[in-house]
């Protein structure tokens, strides 16, 4: 199972649920669904309040029980370490895969933290991060921001990933904007 890590804004916008949580339990495999279940302790929710309704406490995260079908394997044994988890809701349960955005909170730049906390959501409705995988590539729309990190280095370590968000500049136009300047 291979997938290119998305820009964090794309991960935020395409996910039903974005939370901060600690992985606290030993994984279990459900013998009916063949999904692996990790016990988590949620510390913050950044997206998904409406989708979840009253069931606002997520206690488990689910993933396929085998690597080759994109199952997520949690390598850290540090139960106090917080992770940013962006996943999909299926039947009210949080599901993630290898392709999901799951990262130690401490590994995120301050700009990314700000993005997940308040700014990425501003770009979700109108703007699209458009991956540029090979040269030449051109904008398909004024609401697209060309993401060129992959051309230069690892996509999740690039400048645009770590410091920028694709946000509306005016109606019908989105541009890369520094998350540093978003401090209110």
């Amino acid at each position: 199972c291979t997938c290119v890590p998305p820009h964090p804004q794309t991960a935020f916008c395409n996910s039903d649920l974005v939370i901060r949580a600690k992985f606290v339990g030993t994984p279990e495999v459900n013998q009916t669904t063949l999904y692996q279940r990790y016990e988590i302790k949620m510390t913050k929710m950044y997206k998904g309040f409406q989708a979840l309704g009253d069931a606002a406490d997520i206690r488990f995260v689910y993933t396929p029980a085998m690597e080759s079908v994109c199952g997520y394997f949690h390598r850290s044994h540090n139960r106090s370490e917080e992770f940013l988890i962006a996943g999909k809701l299926q039947d009210g349960l949080l599901h993630i895969t290898t392709c999901s955005f799951v990262a130690p909170w401490n590994s995120l730049s301050l700009a990314q933290r700000r993005g997940f906390t308040k700014t990425y959501t501003v770009g979700c409705e109108e703007c699209t991060v458009f991956p540029c995988l090979s040269i030449p590539c051109k904008l398909q729309s004024g609401t697209h921001c060309l993401w060129t990190d992959q051309l230069l280095q690892g996509s999740e370590k690039g400048f645009q990933s770590r410091h920028l968000a694709c946000l509306p500049r005016e109606p019908g136009l989105c541009t890369w904007q520094s998350l540093r300047s978003q401090i209110a």
Epitope: T26, P27, T32, T33, L34, Q36, M66, S68, G71
Partner: antibody
């Protein structure tokens, strides 16, 4: 009484196809994941494939991926294994198992020219 | 391509206790509490004897017990009886290969 009965085994030429069936009774079939496990003559057990209760998730051993397809019909309480591009090394007794607690008696598949 | 390592054979006299080991890695045996043990008599289907490391299905004699330490699981049979003579296989969940078996151990009851 919980019972699993395999059928569909037999002699097939290399490159040929075969479809195994496993009829289940005595339990709520859709509530259990099911597996196929094989055992070559005089050898140990080898997991082949598994499928979730709903049929929505399927897993395969590397040795059969792309050649074998596991499926189930919950309305008929039946598990299937479609085996294509068979090789001599696929020769084995194939067991159907209710996620590895209850096993059928097995059906012999022989791949030979 | 055997994933879990078991001794090829073990023997004991009636009434004795024997232990069969099953050694894996931190990715399978050591990483999860999903180790099962199966008994197989010649020409018969495997029968589940122990699941989830140490649990016995109903109908299985309490002479059979399972345990785990680190990356090694063990099956102990106490008060050995003639009908215990069979092949024994360990099996573990593994995230990469999903399900892995040991190579099997032939148990011989002497005398």
């Amino acid at each position: 009484q919980v019972q699993l009965v395999e059928s569909g085994g037999g002699l097939v030429q290399p490159g040929g196809s075969l479809r195994l069936s496993c009829a289940a009774s005595g339990f709520t079939f859709s509530s259990y994941a099911m597996s196929w496990v094989r055992q070559a003559p005089g050898k140990g057990l080898e997991w082949v494939s598994a499928i979730s209760g709903s049929g929505g998730s399927t897993y395969y051993a590397d040795s059969v991926k792309g050649r074998f397809t596991i499926s189930r019909d919950n309305s008929k309480n039946t598990l299937y294994l479609q085996m294509n591009s068979l090789r001599a090394e696929d020769t084995a007794v194939y067991y159907c198992a209710r996620f590895l607690d209850i096993w059928g008696q097995g059906t012999l598949v022989t791949v030979s020219s | 391509d055997i994933a879990l390592t078991q001794p090829a054979s073990v023997s004991g006299s009636p009434g004795q206790s024997i232990t069969i080991s099953c050694t894996g890695t931190s990715s399978d045996v050591g990483g999860y509490n999903y180790v099962s043990w199966y008994q197989q008599h010649p020409g018969k289907a495997p029968k589940l004897m122990i699941y989830d490391v140490s649990n016995r299905p109903s109908g299985v004699s309490n002479r059979f017990s399972g345990s785990k330490s680190g990356n090694t699981a063990s099956l102990t049979i106490s008060g050995l009886q003639a009908e215990d003579e069979a092949d024994y296989y360990c099996q573990s969940y593994d995230f990469v290969r999903f399900m892995v078996f040991g190579g099997g151990t032939k148990l011989t009851v002497l005398g």
